[in-house]
Interface confidence: medium
């Protein structure tokens, strides 16, 4: 029985050239997190493995930094970074929890953070 929920930063926006922190938080479960994946649509950004630590995909090494915590920091943002991002928590004994964040990278300096929301 999967009882947990993932809280994410929801729909967020940031300025071109700036940076943004993608954060997910797994709550309402005592399951042990064994690995967290960060994926952008059909690309793997990074993995945080409980045993092996962080692995950043080579194509993102220059612009992606691990943390804070199990989150991910995207730097030197471009308009092409706009899109869906997924945090996938592999847990024991619950299984896999997935959270979704939508990032919009804006040309202007008007970039406001969206409200937090929960994904069951």
């Amino acid at each position: 029985m999967m009882t947990g929920t993932i809280e994410t930063t929801g729909n967020i926006s940031a300025e071109k050239g700036g940076s943004i922190i993608l954060q997910c938080h797994l709550s309402s479960t005592t399951a042990q997190v064994t690995q967290v994946n960060w994926e952008q649509q059909d690309q793997l950004l990074a993995i945080c493995n409980a045993d092996l630590g962080w692995h950043i995909s080579p194509s993102f090494k220059d612009r992606v930094a691990p943390g804070p915590g199990l989150g991910l920091t995207l730097q030197s943002l471009t308009v092409n970074d706009t899109g869906e991002y997924f945090c996938i928590y592999h847990t024991y004994p619950d299984g896999t929890y997935t959270g979704r964040i939508f990032l919009e990278v804006l040309e202007s300096s008007v970039a406001e953070h969206g409200a937090r929301f929960q994904i069951p």
Epitope: Q32, Q35, N37, E39, L44, I47, N49, H90, Y92
Partner: antibody
Framework: EVQLQQSGPDLVKPGASVKISCKAS????????MHWVKQSHGKSLEWIGR????????SYNQKFKDKAVLTVDKSSSTAYMEFRSLTSEDSAVYYC???????????????WGQGTSVTVSS | DIVVTQSPASLAVSLGQRATISCRAS??????????IHWYQQKPGQPPKLLIY???NLESGVPARFSGSGSRTDFTLTIDPVEADDAATYYC?????????FGGGTKLEIK
Amino acid sequence: EVQLQQSGPDLVKPGASVKISCKASGYSFTGYYMHWVKQSHGKSLEWIGRVNPNNGGTSYNQKFKDKAVLTVDKSSSTAYMEFRSLTSEDSAVYYCASSPLLRLRGYAMDDWGQGTSVTVSS
Amino acid sequence: DIVVTQSPASLAVSLGQRATISCRASESVDSYGKSFIHWYQQKPGQPPKLLIYVASNLESGVPARFSGSGSRTDFTLTIDPVEADDAATYYCQQNNEDPWTFGGGTKLEIK
């Protein structure tokens, strides 16, 4: 090259147990789930369950919950499936298969062992 | 459990023609824009081989003659054109929720 090498065929008596091994090589053992799949003669495939090598965490098909025990030995990159209280219905080929912990690949089982034939007979 | 039904159970197709295999799930296997359905090929005495993952993605090394389509509950594997080496049994499998389940298989015969 990814390889999943399973132990050889087994002839066992009803009521006994069998333990099948699956030794992985050519990839990072902890980056993949290991699954076990049953195929009775001339029949389709049945998913028995999976084990997460990171911590030995398991998820079972309820049908096999009291029949199969899945374990891993990280030090030797080997997964094991013990099948208990065997009956003639358990005579089948059993496969191990790995799936990367990647949502973008849908956790599909992209590498398979060669299969281990288990025959239950008195 | 999600029940996966394949049709037809067997299929005979002439060399060079198109083969179409259907797969239906008893409930949606979609999650966040991905369809968690995969296709495998199995030849006698061999383990299954992954052909298509996430409904439509061709596994590395698999010929482009194979393609997959569909979403939610209805999926299709197409082989066009069929070659002699394609004679095998094909299975679809869902893993949107536990337990992972397979279709009953479709045996493809080449005429």
